[in-house]
């Protein structure tokens, strides 16, 4: 599998992974004990036909062209978890692996 | 996990799974021996903020609001394989499980 990586200086218009640091402190999310910030990344860009299509299904839907199908969009195709320490609703401290918090790759689906 | 199911008579504007039968014969894709057609489904509809968001990451990116982030789009969040019989490039008949051919659920990511 393959995905493009870009940064804020890139001129790439196609679907690409961009760096993004999420800052829980800046959001005022005080129930998150740690990390206070982490590298989350995000996906942005255009999905020309066939470019970075994750699934054969995407191509088949384009071919069948049903009513209301908007064409593929740039979205995470591989994600990974991070470990977090946080308060749950009962004010207990929880340490756990939270899935799908980091975008590792972007593609068109 | 939860996703909406719609059909061609639905008035739902939000992200939804719609039925779609892919017909390889109609495409002229005769290198696919079987199946000749299968129920693939597809995703279509609007992604209002927080509706059917698959990942906490989606919410975080919205919150951080980086340059060029287009907001979530309606995309497959659960897919399943089908068994296929087909000719490869060397004209050998291959029988195999092809991943991500059927959309089981749609969501916003």
């Amino acid at each position: 599998d393959f995905g493009l990586d870009c940064d804020e200086h890139s001129t790439e218009s196609r679907c690409c992974r961009y760096p993004l640091t999420v800052d829980f402190e800046a959001f005022g999310w005080d129930w998150i004990i740690a990390p206070k910030r982490y590298k989350a990344n995000y996906c942005s860009g255009e999905c020309e036909f066939v470019f970075l299509q994750k699934y054969p299904h995407t191509h088949l839907v384009h071919q069948a062209n049903p009513r209301g199908s908007a064409g593929p969009c740039c979205t995470p195709t591989k994600m990974s978890p991070i470990n977090m320490l946080y308060f749950n609703g009962k004010e207990q401290i929880i340490y756990g692996k939270i899935p799908a918090m980091v975008v590792d790759r972007c593609g068109c689906s | 996990d939860f996703g909406l199911d719609c059909d061609e008579h639905s008035t739902e504007s939000r992200c939804c799974r719609y039925p779609l039968t892919v017909d390889f014969e109609a495409f002229g894709w005769d290198w696919i021996i079987a199946p000749k057609r299968y129920k693939a489904n597809y995703c279509s509809g609007e992604c209002e903020f927080v509706f059917l968001q698959k990942y906490p990451h989606t919410h975080l990116v919205h919150q951080a609001n980086p340059r060029g982030s287009a907001g979530p789009c309606c995309t497959p969040t659960k897919m399943s394989p089908i068994n296929m019989l087909y000719f490869n490039g060397k004209e050998q008949i291959i029988y195999g499980k092809i991943p991500a051919m059927v959309v089981d659920r749609c969501g916003c990511s």
Partner: antibody, heavy 124, light 107 residues
């Protein structure tokens, strides 16, 4: 509806060749295997081979391999079976049959449509 | 090649009878067995595939069973139109091979 129409009866001399045709209609000809089966008078059925019209990939019974050629003409949706160096024991009715895939496994097939058969008589 | 031995080679029965035809393969054929009916001067007609599945449009009086090397075709209540020759076919391996046939005659 799906139909296979075969060419008419032939009388051939030993050592000659015969080419039997099978014209398909009512379906996408290129996407289904065509098989050839023969039956000598008063005898059982014998599988000769198959061909996939899309790419002409074929598979022959070793018993006939040196003498048989299966071909297709996609423009007319017609399959052909040529048998060379005919002998008297090649006298038989030759059938074409479409092989239909019904299942989920690599050998999930059955014959759903047959041609009417072509009698080939080999006699000096 | 896989040998298919069909028995009996001929069988006399009366209308209303229940009859069974067997087919034995020279090795395990993984239930890739079909049954055909053939009437004089006609092409064979598929009845059963994958050992026990009925082809669309075939009456339920026909049934198939078996696994491994041994398979049977049963006709539950014979009607005049059922008197014909029946063949089995293995499709587990190339070349496909047929049984020698069972001729079902009116007693």
């Amino acid at each position: 509806q799906v139909q296979l129409v075969q060419s008419g009866a032939e009388v051939k001399k030993p050592g000659a060749s015969v080419k039997v045709s099978c014209k398909a209609s009512g379906y996408s000809f290129t996407g289904y295997f065509m098989h050839w089966v023969r039956q000598a008078p008063g005898q059982g059925l014998e599988w000769m081979g198959n061909i996939y019209p899309y790419n002409s990939v074929s598979n022959y019974n070793q018993r006939f391999k040196a003498r048989v050629t299966m071909t297709v003409d996609k423009s007319t949706s017609t399959a052909y079976m040529e048998l060379r160096s005919l002998r008297s024991d090649d006298t038989a009715v030759y059938y074409c049959a479409r092989r239909y895939y019904y299942g989920t496994g690599p050998a999930d097939w059955y014959y759903d449509v047959w041609g009417q058969g072509t009698l080939v008589t080999v006699s000096s | 090649d896989i040998q298919m031995t069909q028995s009996p080679s001929s069988l006399s029965a009366s209308v209303g009878d229940r009859v069974t035809i067997t087919c034995k393969a020279s090795q395990d054929i993984n239930s890739y067995l079909s049954w055909f009916q053939q009437k004089p001067g006609k092409a064979p007609k598929s009845l059963i595939y994958r050992a026990n599945r009925l082809v669309d449009g075939v009456p339920s009086k026909f049934s198939g069973s078996g696994s491994g090397q041994d398979y049977t075709l049963t006709i539950s209540s014979l009607q005049p139109e059922d008197f014909a020759t029946y063949y089995c076919l293995q499709s587990d391996e190339f070349p496909l091979t047929f049984g020698q046939g069972t001729k079902l005659e009116i007693k």
